[in-house]
Every structure is written in C-alpha cells, then in structure tokens.
C-alpha cells in the first residue's frame, strides 16, 4: 500500500478520487471549506466534500448495496429458477408418458375403443397438466368424467356391440348407470386417492419453488432506505473529505451498518429456514402415492385392470343395464 | 394381462437387473435439489457478514475507519464511534420490514403452512381401507421402490427408471406400447397398486 | 492471495512515452474493474484512469484526458497504462488498484508501485 500522504492543502486529491463517480469538478471544492451544510460526512475541521457530494456519495451507496445484495443472491436465484424449470417440464414429460402408455394400451388390448379412448385419455391427462400448473379443476371430477365417458363406449363395444351408438339418450343413462352400479367396481376411487395425493403434493412443489423465486427476487430488488444511504456513505466515502484516500472501514463498523441496513430483509430469516425444512419433509414424502411419476405412469395398468373388472362382471351388468337403461333404448330401437 | 409386442416384453426375471443404477430419476434430482438449497438456509440471517466479506473491510491493515475517523483495527472504537451522534441504529431497526417484505413474509407463512399440512411421515404405509370392498395397497420396503404383483410370483422390486433428465427433449409415440413392463394382475378383489414404470427409451 | 505487480516505470524526457503494466492474480481479472493512481513526490494520491472489467467503459482524471490510455488483457491478467505526451508533474509512483464491489469507495488491493520520472 502506498505511504501515507502528508496534509493537503488543497483539495487535489480529493477531486480526482470524486472524479471516479462523478466526471467535470464543480461539485468539488478547491480547498478546504467548513461544511456547516453537510448532514452526513460531519467535519471535524475544514473538508474537501460538498453537499452535492454527499448527494452522490449517497445515491452510489444504495445502488452499491442493491448490487452487492443481487450478487450475493445470484447463486440461489440461479438454482431455484433452473429446478423450477426442469421439474416443471420433466412433470409434463411424465404425463405426457403416462398419456401415452394408456393410449398403447387401448390400441393393444381394445382396437374397438381407440378412437373414442384416445379423445377421453387426451382430455384426461390434459386436465391432469393443467391441475399441476395450479388450473382449479377437481381431481375426483376428472376421474369421473374419464370413466363415465369411457363406460358407454365399453358398453356399446366390447358388452353389447350389436347396440347402435348413435344417440346420445343411452349414453347418458349409460353414464349414470357406471356411478350407480359401480360398474367398475372401486378402480374409480382408487385412482381418484392416488391421482389426488400425487397431483396435490407436485403442484404444491413446483408452487413452493416459484414461491422461492418470488422471495429471492423480492428481496433482490428491494430499495435501501435513506437511512441506510447515509450510514453507508459514512462508511464507504466520508474518509475521502478528510483526506484519508486508502483507509478501509473497520470490519465489526461494517457488521453493524449492514446489521441496520438489513434488519428488514434479515427477517425473513425465520420463515426461509422453515420454508426449506418444509420442502424437505415434503419431498422426502414423495415416494408411492405421493410420487405422481410412480401413480400416473402406472394408470395404465389400473384402468386395463378396471376394463376387465367390467368384463369379468359383463353378464349381470348387461342385464342390470337392460332393465335400467331400457326406455332409452327403446327409443333407440324405434 | 395387457398385451404387449413381444419386443417390448421382458421375462419378469431379467426385470431384476434390467435398470441402471445410476440413472436420474425424478426422485433423487429432488432430493438432489433440497441438499443444495439446505447449504442456503442461513442465507439470510448471514447476509450482512456475506455482505462485509464482498465490500472492502480492513482485514490485514493496522488502521481502519469507523465512520468519524482513523481508529486501530482491534479498538473498542472500532465498531461503536461511528455510530454515535448519527441517527439512531436502534430506531432504523424498530421501524419494521418494509411493505413488500411483509407481503413475502404472509407468502411464506402460507406456504410453509401448505407444505407441512402436505408433508406425509416418512415410511408411512399406504392407505388402507381405501375402499369397502377390500382393495389394498402393498407396501414394499424402500423408498424408491416399487412393487409388482405377478399372480402368485410374489414381490418382484423394480427402480423407478424414467430417466427424466435425458428425457427432456424426448417425446414418446402413441404407437409406444408401455416397454419394459410386467402387468400387474389383481386378484379377485385385490389389486397391486405399483406397477413398473419401464425403461422409457 | 491477491497480488498486483507494476512494471515500465522509469526516467523519460518531457513529451516523451511510457507503457506501464500490470500483472495481477488470486483473483478473477476479468471480472474486476481496475484503476491506477498515482503519488507525486510529497504530495498526497491522485486518481488517474479506471477501466472495467471487460475493458469495455474507461474513465480518467481531466488532466491525463487525451493523453494516457487505460487498457487490459484479460486472457494476461495484465491492465495497462500506456502515458503519451509527459510532463513534469506527471512524475509520481504510480500504483495499480483492484476496484472493489463498491463503485468509487476504497479499492481492495494495491500493487508495490513502479516509479516514473519526467525530467530533462
């Protein structure tokens, strides 16, 4: 470090360290003056600052601090946006899988069905994304919705395919009759369990990490009081009008400035750490019907099993169906 | 049991070592995730010595500045002269979070609220009684696990293999037929929850 | 540990050229705005050129303005000072400075000073 400067009788050296912040010298005085206007940088005797100074001196202060704390927050900001992306889009992937999956199994196992399975699978696991992405739609309503679209194509094709499919007058009995006969036994319900609590825990998740984002960029924009300015610049720039071009703050006098700039943001504190424990008995809770990629790539095989249900029991159900369904499907007949 | 093409199937006995260990699943990039964001948990409690620590401080120098004038590093008027006859260090902190800090503040209140009432204990057993009708769930050991029921195979464990990461620019065909998969074959009344999720390639 | 080496000092006649190097390292160069400074003989420091890190933005005291030129390579770790036109008051120990996050506050780091005289 260079030797210590003798007394300046002018303000030189002052000027051209201003200069660094501010280009042109009108601000600076050209020797030292009382500065019985300063409201920050006190003098003791004469001083090289202006009240302008100050003025910049407190401006550069603040926009330091906003600087320092996004630099401080990069790290973070950088792992939460880039997991909140890749989760959101692998959760997409699985459904699209899983979508997929119960499509190749009906092309496979129920030819007859495709077309019309296919547009209900679609829908389904649609409504599925959607839920994920925060949309307020029912999970026990898109489980219903699939099998009670589902029950009238299965009835008309695979249980009785001589039946014309035409009018809509049997299909809605037809969807009446799949909740009140329990048609497929409890496949509906099971799934509704499974869907919900794997659906609820990953939205909440993927809510969680844009909430993390939020936190992080709240704080990373927030705007330092005036207060927080002048301590800042009593730390930082008031040595300069004394002349004193090399010394730095004391390391505790920093700790204190901060301590009081931050006493706001430090509050969060609380809530961060328990925000992070939280998440962390969360996921640590994601595994079996709590994992949405375990539950919705295994739908596939719950509804074949849920088909067959219906196949095994077609006998009395047809027959139940008849008598039920029956004024429906007179009018069809005629 | 669905059908599936004869390429895609594969013998219940190879499904043993038909996953790589070291795959990525969505499950431990979770976990993954939450080890790195503990390293943050102190974040903002440790702000302003990260702060001090980024912005120049008298480290090796003899002398340093408190706010008034040039003091001795290790003096007691290291840290307090600068703050005297200044406004009150006391005051700025009474004054409260700012509006927007609070605001997040609620936010994480809330949500911290949303995820413990969603927080399972771990190695709960999957509900039972989910039906009247005496449907249950298996459970099978370990975390990552999950349980296929063969009709009278017993418990064939399986590694949950959706290799999300190198799958994030993959899309699969709907001629795809589930790979790797054995079905589940629910007994009369029964029915095996998990299935395996297949080598998706 | 971060250290700065000035080198290129020395006696020039009036009007005459220097280039004055830096050579830094213990930190990442590229990313650090740097400054020189100087200190005439019995007299107190004077700023005299800044330069971001990227060398994209560069500033100067008025009375080196047209006359010296900040510069750096960052894949050398090296700023430079190259200083046209001398006079007699340009003679000083000029040091390199690491800027620190706070822009215009007190630099982090200094180098030992290399030493320039301008005489006839």
């Known amino acids: 470090q260079p030797p210590p400067p003798p007394p300046d009788a002018t303000c030189h050296q002052v000027r051209s360290f201003f200069q660094r912040l501010q280009p042109g010298l009108k601000w600076v005085p050209e020797t030292p003056v009382p500065g019985s206007d300063l409201q920050v940088c006190l003098p003791k005797g004469p001083t090289c600052c202006s009240r302008k100074m100050e003025e910049k001196y407190q401006l550069t202060a603040r926009l330091n601090m906003e600087q320092l704390l996004q630099s401080a927050s990069m790290e973070l900001k950088f792992l939460i946006i880039q997991n909140a992306a890749v989760f959101q889009e692998a959760f997409e992937i699985v459904v699209r899988h899983a979508k997929n999956y119960t499509n190749a199994m009906f092309k496979n196992n129920y030819p007859s069905l495709t077309p019309q399975a296919f547009e209900f699978v679609g829908e389904f696991f649609t409504d599925v994304s959607l839920y994920i992405l925060g949309s307020d739609i029912n999970v026990d309503d898109m489980v219903n919705e699939l099998f009670d679209s589902l029950f009238p194509v299965i009835y008309t094709q695979l249980m009785n395919p001589g039946l014309p499919d035409s009018a809509l007058d049997i299909n809605e009995c037809l969807r009446g009759a799949r909740r009140d006969l329990k048609v497929f036994g409890n496949f509906p319900k099971l799934i509704m369990t499974q869907v919900s609590k794997s659906l609820q825990v990953t939205r909440i998740f993927l809510q969680a990490l844009n909430l993390g984002i939020e936190v992080i960029n709240t704080t990373d924009h927030l705007k330092f009081s005036k207060d927080c300015g002048r301590m800042l610049t009593r730390m930082w720039y008031c040595s300069y009008c004394q002349g004193l071009m090399m010394v730095k703050p004391c390391g505790g006098y920093c700790n204190v400035v901060m301590q009081g700039c931050m006493a706001g943001v430090v509050e969060i504190d609380k809530y961060w750490r328990e925000y992070i424990l939280s998440l962390e008995e969360l996921v640590n809770g994601m595994y079996r019907i709590y994992d949405m990629e375990n539950v919705l790539l295994g739908l596939f095989s719950t509804i074949h099993d849920s088909i067959q249900y219906v196949q095994k029991n077609a006998g009395k159900l047809t027959t139940t169906i008849g008598k039920l369904c029956a004024h429906s499907q007179q009018r069809q007949y005629r | 049991s669905a059908y599936y093409p004869e390429d895609l199937f594969i013998d219940k006995k190879v499904l043993k070592v038909a996953h790589v260990e070291h795959e990525e699943t969505l499950s431990s990039r979770r976990r993954e995730l939450i080890q790195k964001l503990k390293s943050f948990i102190s974040f903002y409690s440790a702000l302003p010595g990260y702060i001090c620590s980024h912005s120049p401080v008298a480290e090796n120098d003899t002398l340093c500045w408190n706010g008034q004038e040039l003091v001795e590093r290790y003096s007691q008027k290291a840290a307090r002269n600068g703050m005297k006859n200044q406004f009150n260090l006391h005051e700025l902190k009474m004054k409260g979070p700012e509006p927007v800090v609070s605001q997040i503040i609620d936010k994480l209140k809330h949500i911290n609220q949303l995820l413990r009432t969603m927080s399972m204990p771990k190695g709960r057993v999957l509900d039972k009684n989910l039906d009247e009708e005496g449907f249950e769930s298996g459970d099978c050991g370990d975390d990552e696990d999950e349980c296929i029921g063969g009709s009278g195979d017993g418990m064939i464990k399986v590694k949950n293999q959706l290799r999300f990461l190198a799958e994030l620019a993959y899309d699969l065909d709907v001629d795809d037929a589930p790979g790797n998969s054995q079905q589940a074959t629910p007994k009369d009344n029964e029915i095996s929850t998990f299935h395996n999720l297949g080598n998706v390639h | 540990e971060v250290q700065l080496v000035e080198s290129g000092g020395g006696l020039v006649q009036p009007g005459g050229s220097l280039r004055l190097s830096c050579a830094a390292s213990?930190?990442?160069?590229?990313?650090?705005?740097m400054s020189w400074v100087r200190q005439a003989p019995g007299k107190g420091l004077e700023w005299v050129s800044a330069i971001s890190g990227s060398g994209g933005s560069t500033n100067y005291v008025d009375s080196v303005k047209g006359r010296f030129t900040v510069s750096r390579d960052n894949s050398k770790n090296t700023l430079y000072l190259q200083m046209n036109r001398l006079r007699a008051e340009d003679t000083a120990v000029y040091y390199c400075?690491?800027?620190?996050?706070?822009?215009?506050?007190?630099?982090?780091?200094w180098g030992q000073g290399t030493t320039v005289t301008v005489s006839s």
């Open positions: 400075a690491k800027e620190s996050m706070v822009r215009g506050g007190p630099f982090d780091y």
């Open positions: 213990g930190f990442t160069f590229s990313s650090s705005a």
